[in-house]
Interface confidence: low
């Protein structure tokens, strides 16, 4: 009679992460009597999978019943696989011994390879504000897939980024995978919208790839422009002044408004107006009673805007230009919150 | 401003190769993405190729995909493209641009590319 062969039919097997593995193994032959043994890996560091004679084996069960005096099917089903799954496993074949039974013939080995999704990408952006023209930094990392092969893709606002730099990690054979990605984004007045997008595409993604995406509105910092101007006299001897503070973001800004250098007011904004791009513009006015004044005065609008050293700008109100009238009070009257006499 | 200056170009049989070349006079072209445009008489510009800063990055329009190579040697600051089994029907004018914005990298549209070459004549004819 032919001696026994242990047969494993599958080459290799490919299964998705949380699946079963179903590993193939026949036996030619009844005799010698004994267990059949599934081991991953070969040599003294191999690792039992399952044992026909003896031990708990959870996630292990058989195809057919091994109990069968003439059952020859040793197949066995691995449940919830997971990349550290993967590896070479072998069918032994054992004879029955006294006291141990003896490794008697070995299948070829079937290499079990796990398909893991990436985790879904996250993009984290600089920890500091950038203004526009400024390059910023953003990252991009996903974890635990396999296969290693992976196609990484940055857009902005739909346009594809390409001054970025990836690797994948580790860069020898491993159970799973990283992916780390590092691209630069040039900020621009108008990215307030703006989103920075991560996109990971996977052979177990089935060409629905992932995506990762940042707001552009977390990382700019759009410095805002003012302008200083004298409204008409709202009476014979009081002057509206505004300082118009537009085209900024984000929201955080303090004006404070100086007569001569020596301060005379400060206000938060609060009751801003949005633009299309995102940016705000807030107006502050002042009501000055030129009649306080025997000169020039030197009106300087100052801002503060997200913590940043303070801008300004200046206007010259020229005292001369509006008749004095005698006696007259010297406290106009303060009709709003953003308005103010100048002494 | 980038002064970008193509060579290469000239009379070539069907199926035959050239390889364009794309350079800076201000040495600044490894800088930036850049990108291959044609234009045949009585058509639109269209991309051709791009790539971007670092070279990692190449795209192609699907006429010359598989026929056409972009490529970069930034140590000597030039932009290549390699033209294989050429047809009738690539015979144009070749501009090479620069997209001084440097992050984007498209070749669907020349909106992108702010700085353009003169241009080289390609003729493929028998």
């Known amino acids: 009679e032919e001696e026994l062969q242990v047969i494993q039919p599958d080459k290799s097997v490919l299964v998705a992460a949380g699946e079963t593995a179903t590993l193939r193994c026949t036996a030619t032959s009844l005799i010698p009597v004994g267990p059949i043994q599934w081991f991953r890996g070969a040599g003294p560091g191999r690792e039992l999978i399952y044992n026909q004679k003896e031990g708990h084996f959870p996630r292990v069960t058989t195809v057919s019943d091994l109990t069968k005096r003439n059952n020859m099917d040793f197949s066995i089903r691995i449940g919830n696989i997971t990349p550290a799954d993967a590896g070479t496993y072998y069918c032994v074949k054992f004879r029955k011994g006294s006291p141990d039974d003896v490794e008697f013939k070995s299948g070829a080995g079937t290499e079990l390879s796990v398909r893991a999704k990436p985790s879904a990408p996250v993009v984290s952006g600089p920890a500091a504000r950038a203004t526009p023209q400024h390059t910023v930094s953003f990252t991009c990392e996903s974890h635990g897939f396999s296969p290693r092969d992976i196609t990484l893709k940055w857009f902005k606002n739909g346009n594809e980024l390409s001054d970025f730099q990836t690797n994948v990690d580790p860069v020898g054979e491993s159970v799973s995978y990283s992916i780390h990605s590092t691209a630069k984004v040039v900020l621009t007045r108008e990215d307030v919208h703006s989103q920075v997008i991560c996109e990971v595409a996977h052979v177990t993604l089935q060409g629905d790839p992932l995506r990762g995406t940042a707001n552009l509105s977390e990382t700019i910092r759009v410095p805002p422009t003012l302008e200083v101007t004298q409204q008409p006299v709202r009476a014979e001897n009081q002057v509206n002044v505004t300082c118009q503070v537009r085209k900024f973001y984000p929201q955080r800004l303090q004006l404070t408004w100086l007569e001569n250098g020596n301060v005379s007011r400060t206000e938060t904004a609060s009751t801003v107006t949005e633009n299309k791009d995102g940016t705000y513009n807030w107006m502050s006015w002042l009501l000055v009673n030129v009649s306080a004044h025997r000169d020039d005065v030197k009106l300087t609008c100052q801002v503060e805007h997200d913590g940043q050293p303070a801008v300004s700008k200046s206007h010259d109100l020229k005292v001369s230009a509006h008749p004095k009238e005698q006696g007259s009070n010297t406290a106009a009257e303060n009709t709003g919150s953003n308005e103010r006499n100048i002494y | 401003q980038v002064q970008l200056v193509e060579s290469g170009g000239g009379l070539v049989q069907p199926g035959g190769s050239l390889r364009l070349s794309c350079a800076d006079s201000?040495?600044?072209?490894?800088?930036?993405?850049t990108g291959w445009f044609r234009q045949a008489p009585g058509r639109e510009r269209e991309g051709v190729a791009c790539?971007?800063?670092?070279?990692?990055?190449?795209r192609y329009t699907d006429s010359v995909r598989g026929r056409f190579t972009i490529s970069r040697d930034n140590a000597r600051r030039t932009v290549y493209l390699q033209m294989n089994s050429l047809r009738p029907e690539d015979t144009a004018v070749y501009y090479c641009?620069?997209?001084?914005?440097?992050?984007?990298?498209?070749?669907?549209?020349?909106?992108?590319?702010?700085?353009w070459g003169q241009g080289t004549q390609v003729t493929v004819s028998s």
């Open positions: 201000e040495f600044r072209l490894d800088e930036y993405a």
């Open positions: 790539i971007s800063r670092s070279g990692s990055n190449t």
């Open positions: 641009a620069a997209d001084l914005t440097s992050h984007y990298l498209s070749c669907s549209s020349y909106t992108d590319y702010n700085s």
